[in-house]
């Protein structure tokens, strides 16, 4: 019987060319976790593993750091980087958990005041 | 440099059984999920069994369930494959392989063949 | 179960010809798709995993992609040494399964 329960940061706002860090926490489980996979859409992001460590996909090496923890860090953020991400916990003996964070990347501050001036 | 080394294949009866072990070397054995695939001649793959890196799960496919079982031996770096209640259709070359991230399949042995036959 | 169903079964090409094998899972599978190449009687070599990922000490002409249910592995450049068999495989869920093959011969 699966009694664990994923905590997730939610719903966050990044400011584009800025950095954030996902985070999922498993609780009220004693369950082993053997791996974590995070996921962005249909797309394998990174991978950290209770043995062999993380694995980052090749595409996204330069733009995603390991942790902290079971955490995932997104740097150099495009507006592109808006949408769903998934921490997939694969627990023995419980099975699969999983939690859902929106991001949402917005232009800059700066960006914005500067877009405001150049309008006659 | 990663080597996986099948053996005990051979020539048995319907109903008979053999075991299959794979010799592990030039990594940490312990550290990675194992699978066992299949080769019938002349057909494709056919994934049979894997097991996670400490050994404590386990998953067959339906065609082998309760009939094959997988192990292994950490200490021994060796993967085992017990099959029973042989028939004609297990005849194949059987693949040891390691499992990266429990996602791909990063080596393969040479394969043992298995045939069936009265 | 999930099916996974590779086209075409097999096709001739010459060296030099750029070729597509496509797969389509039976459901979404993510991006939990590997491809693999094999020659006669040899064992399978991982070729491309997590759809797009080539592995390492593969060459860059071979390429894959796709996410959800359809994927593609790309050889840009036919070389002699491609000619054999490829198969593509999900490990989205157990069971694991792999596609029928394609058979990639010389025209």
């Known amino acids: 019987m699966m009694t664990g329960t994923i905590e997730t940061t939610g719903n966050i706002s990044a400011e584009k060319g800025g950095s954030i860090i996902l985070q999922c926490h498993l609780s009220s489980t004693t369950a082993q976790v053997t791996q974590v996979n995070w996921e962005q859409q249909d797309q394998l992001l990174a991978i950290c593993n209770a043995d062999l460590g993380w694995h980052i996909s090749p595409s996204f090496k330069d733009r995603v750091a390991p942790g902290p923890g079971l955490g995932l860090t997104l740097q150099s953020l495009t507006v592109n980087d808006t949408g769903e991400y998934f921490c997939i916990y694969h627990t023995y003996p419980d099975g699969t958990y999983t939690g859902r964070i929106f991001l949402e990347v917005l232009e800059s501050s700066v960006a914005e005041h500067g877009a405001r001036f150049q309008i006659p | 440099e990663v080597q996986l080394l099948e053996s005990g294949g051979g020539l048995v009866q319907p109903g008979g059984s053999l075991r299959l072990s794979c010799a592990a070397s030039?990594?940490?054995?312990?550290?990675?999920?194992m699978h066992w695939v299949r080769q019938a001649p002349g057909k494709g793959l056919e994934w049979v069994s894997g097991?996670?890196?400490?050994?404590?799960?386990?998953s067959y496919a339906d065609s082998v369930k309760g009939r094959f079982t997988i192990s292994r031996d950490n200490s021994k770096n060796t993967l085992y494959l017990q099959m029973n209640s042989l028939r004609a259709e297990d005849t194949a070359v059987y693949y040891c392989?390691?499992?990266?991230?429990?996602?791909?399949?990063?080596?393969w042995g040479q394969g043992t063949l298995v045939t069936v036959s009265s | 179960d999930i099916q996974m169903t590779q086209s075409p079964s097999s096709l001739s090409a010459s060296v030099g010809d750029r070729v597509t094998i496509t797969c389509r899972a039976s459901?979404?599978?993510?991006?939990?798709l590997n491809w693999y190449q094999q020659k006669p009687g040899k064992a399978p070599k991982l070729l491309i995993y997590?759809?797009?990922s080539l592995q390492s000490g593969v060459p860059s002409r071979f390429s894959g992609s796709g996410s959800g249910t359809d994927f593609t592995l790309t050889i840009s450049s036919l070389q002699p040494e491609d000619f054999a068999t490829y198969y593509c495989?999900?490990?989205?869920?157990?069971?694991?399964?792999f596609g029928g093959g394609t058979k990639v011969e010389i025209k």
């Open positions: 392989a390691r499992v990266a991230y429990s996602v791909w399949i990063d080596y």
């Open positions: 030039g990594f940490t054995f312990s550290s990675y999920a």
């Open positions: 097991i996670s890196s400490n050994g404590g799960s386990t």
């Open positions: 459901q979404s599978i993510s991006s939990y």
């Open positions: 997590a759809a797009s």
């Open positions: 495989q999900q490990s989205y869920s157990t069971p694991l399964t």
